[in-house]
Interface confidence: medium
């Protein structure tokens, strides 16, 4: 039978590191906490897209806090050669697009998307929530952006920023993009509350994108998705104060803060400044 046929067909992971989707806490503001110590720490600044120094008071605060610049970069910028995406100007897909889907060993059963190299399309699969590989996207759009051939040979990132084919630069200030690539805050903020599969009843908050507010829900203790915060404040930080405004179809994306045009690399899920 088919199971016996598969006995010797084992899907092996590749040299690439596993996918870790951009963490919600990388979008949190630096939080020095209520204590009075003076401790040099680093946080990821979503506006400059760089890891920067701040003074931490020594208690509480949030998870966007790292002991070293390297740790911060490793966690929030993914500045890693294996993860840098070759743009479609060279008509190349990143290597991880060719990996088989990998559910991982855990039992979260989260809907994710992977690029199927046989059908040349992004398809849905169930991810367990841990381990796995990089061919794993939270939304169909993300998967298409990264692994399917984009329109006109452009690689379009999730912030609606388009690569300029002439000078290899990005213009994030005011870019017309197809409605498919509209930005509505971090992708997990758009997902519904997900209790998960276990039996606990923990008080958590999720961002309700319909009403634009953080609301409480009961979390089971395992699985679920990233739209899951231990406090309303954390929820608001991550989702309510999205740094790119909502837009109507065909409209312009405008950042809330002006930024200088920067030469950047296109990379999975994020824009990275060179030589950070």
């Amino acid at each position: 039978d088919s199971e016996e046929d598969e006995e010797h067909t084992i899907i092996t992971d590749t040299e690439l590191p596993p996918l870790k989707l951009m963490h919600s806490f990388c979008a949190f503001k630096a939080d020095d906490g209520p204590c009075k110590a003076i401790m040099k720490r680093f946080f990821f600044n979503i506006f400059t897209r760089q890891c920067e120094e701040f003074i931490y008071g020594g208690c509480e605060g949030n998870q966007n806090r790292f002991e070293s610049l390297e740790e911060c970069k490793k966690m929030c910028t993914r500045d890693n050669a294996n993860r840098i995406i070759k743009t479609t100007l060279q008509q190349e897909k990143p290597d991880f697009c060719f990996l088989e889907e990998d559910p991982g060993i855990c039992r979260g059963y989260i809907t994710r998307y992977f690029y199927n190299n046989q059908t040349k399309q992004c398809e849905r699969f169930k991810y367990g929530g841990c381990l796995g590989n990089m061919n794993n996207f939270e939304t169909l759009e993300e998967c298409k952006n990264i692994c399917e051939d984009g329109p006109n040979g452009f690689q379009v990132d999730n912030y609606g920023t388009q690569l300029n084919a002439v000078n290899n630069s990005l213009t994030p200030q005011s870019t017309k993009v197809p409605s498919l690539f509209e930005f509505h805050g971090p992708s997990w903020c758009l997902t519904p509350a997900d209790r998960g599969l276990c039996r606990a009843n923990e008080n958590r908050f999720y961002y309700n994108s319909v009403i634009g507010k953080c609301r409480p829900f009961k979390y089971s203790g395992c699985g679920g998705n990233e739209n899951n915060f231990t406090s309303k404040q954390e929820c608001l930080r991550a989702c309510k104060k999205g740094f790119i405004q909502r837009i109507s179809k065909g409209g312009l994306i405008k950042t809330k803060r002006k930024r200088k045009k920067q030469r950047v690399k296109i990379a999975y899920e994020e824009i990275f400044v060179k030589n950070m």
Partner: antibody
Framework: QVQLQQSGPGLVKPSQTLSLTCAIS??????????WGWIRQSPGRGLEWLGF?????????SYAVSVKSRITINPDTSKNQFSLQLNSVTPEDTAVYYC???????????WGQGTLVTVSS | DIVLTQSPATLSLSPGERATLSCRAS???????LAWYQQKPGQAPRLLIY???SRATGVPARFSGSGSGTDFTLTISSLEPEDFATYYC?????????FGQGTKVEIK
Amino acid sequence: QVQLQQSGPGLVKPSQTLSLTCAISGDSVSSNGAAWGWIRQSPGRGLEWLGFIYRRSKWYNSYAVSVKSRITINPDTSKNQFSLQLNSVTPEDTAVYYCARQDGMGGMDSWGQGTLVTVSS
Amino acid sequence: DIVLTQSPATLSLSPGERATLSCRASQSVSSFYLAWYQQKPGQAPRLLIYGSSSRATGVPARFSGSGSGTDFTLTISSLEPEDFATYYCQQYDSTPSTFGQGTKVEIK
């Protein structure tokens, strides 16, 4: 209660292949809710995860980069066991090797008794 | 790889005392996927805590786990003679799964 019973030689010559087997009772190697892995422990390196195999819609495996070019973990559904093969061993591969069941949400909840493998000529 | 650093390396306490063991990750780890193990000489590790705070089957209530992000703690509220052992944390959030170097709890 899941039980894991390890078997295999305790002495392997350098450049040869280390082979260990882990027999499972109380669960199935094809279980949809677990992974079956190998961990080793040596004074110099502590506990080191080597890799595991697991079945969902098909078989998958995942290996530590440090041994990736040399390791194979295979299931044997007919005997309800899984095996470790580590090629081209050196004295640095001397360690106590454990097989373990990694629960889908709950850590490594069952372990084999451990096998001290010495790599020496 | 995610590096887990346990502290202290050795903890010298008397029976009845409270033990607090720390596990710090080099990157944030989902609290769903952090486990603690106990190991005695000549034995395989034994799962104590999974999901950072859930006790495994048969583990006494004096063992508790807490933490999130990069900082996790195993607490033994009142040490029993059989608790003197080495304790390891493990993350299975990101490939490869990694272990801490261990904390030995010894009798003072």
